[in-house]
Interface confidence: medium
């Protein structure tokens, strides 16, 4: 769960409906899957599929479930204790240094290099120099057999693999 929580992440709820489970806070904190009531006396359960909390907390609202973008697949749904798990579609990957973006995997290595790793949802293809065997860092979108120009529009934090 991200340490940075903004107002937008919180899912405002109505006063606890009868079906919402209540329990008492332990040392001022409520267990995962719950948030604390405004008066601090009760722990109110999150709503399945709508919001969640992963840790013991004193949040007034549970966190809103993430919705997978149309360029992602949902690996597991949002529960009261865990956010939705989304993964880049086949043929795209999410970089470590910009984890919000899925990028199209390259389809070949630059001239003089060989492919040693496939495209996965977590990494682009891996290329090494034929002679030295050293890894290639930095993106070269051109594929050996085709003269290409680098695609213009940047990776998107919206629909991630359009």
């Amino acid at each position: 769960e991200s340490a940075l929580i903004t107002q937008q992440d919180l899912a405002p709820q109505q006063r606890a409906a009868p079906q919402q489970k209540r329990s008492s806070p332990s040392e001022g904190l409520c267990p995962p899957g719950h948030h604390i009531s405004e008066d601090g006396r009760d722990c109110i359960s999150c709503k399945y599929g709508q919001d969640y909390s992963t840790h013991w907390n004193d949040l007034l609202f549970c966190l809103r479930c993430t919705r997978c973008d149309s360029g992602e697949v949902e690996l597991s749904p949002c529960t009261t204790t865990r956010n939705t798990v989304c993964q880049c579609e086949e043929g795209t990957f999410r970089e470590e240094d910009s984890p919000e973006m899925c990028r199209k995997c390259r389809t070949g290595c630059p001239r003089g290099m060989v492919k040693v790793g496939d495209c996965t949802p977590w990494s682009d293809i891996e290329c090494v120099h034929k002679e030295s065997g050293t890894k290639h860092s930095g993106e070269v979108p051109a594929v050996e057999e085709t003269v290409t120009s680098s695609p213009g529009t940047p990776a998107s934090p919206c629909s991630l693999s359009g």
Partner: antibody
Framework: EVQLQQSGAEPVKSGASVKLSCTAS????????IHWVKQRPEQGLEWIGR????????KYDPKFQGKATITADTSSNTVYLQFSSLTSEDAAVYYC???????????WGQGSTLTVSS | DIVMTQSPSSLAVSAGERVTMSCKSS????????????LAWYQQKPGQFPKLLIY???TRESGVPDRFTGSGSGTDFTLTISSVQAEDLAVYYC????????FGGGTKLELK
Amino acid sequence: EVQLQQSGAEPVKSGASVKLSCTASGFNIKDTFIHWVKQRPEQGLEWIGRIDPANGNTKYDPKFQGKATITADTSSNTVYLQFSSLTSEDAAVYYCSRGTTVYYFDHWGQGSTLTVSS
Amino acid sequence: DIVMTQSPSSLAVSAGERVTMSCKSSQSLLNSRTRKNCLAWYQQKPGQFPKLLIYWASTRESGVPDRFTGSGSGTDFTLTISSVQAEDLAVYYCQQSFDLPTFGGGTKLELK
């Protein structure tokens, strides 16, 4: 220079099928997604679907599912849109367009005009 | 489907005028993880194909003149042309990419 060259005007009979083509130059289609967009006279734009030519994966707007089929031939850097059981509702200009990692379309073909006669 | 509604449907302007057009979506286009609005604007001149002007609601595509500005967040977006030129006469479409793409009905910019 990035270009998408589309096949010309297609006059077809109602009930028939048609296959429109879109040939890319200046880039490898396997490095992008290719989309098809429909535009009827005096009407707005409707997204039909897209293909990832690297693996053949397609995604369609539900209203075009079963009606439209998008395929790619990476050896000729060409993407196709096939329509079956044509009706007057299918008469429109069809554009192919390129998306790199997004559902925004940064380059477009010049459009293929499809006319359907009874 | 996310429904995109543009207004006005047409707009008569004089050269040099400042013009704004609106685009509203039936649900928020703000991606909660990335804080980006998944909205683009296109320009389509008569007899031509659409051209991408703005993406992520406010980022200008390279080569687009800086008189074109996109703004807004959530469900309400605006395209502003600070000083309309004769070559700007066209239909302008907004498009969401939060879900499978849908376009607004367009705003036609005409000369007075």
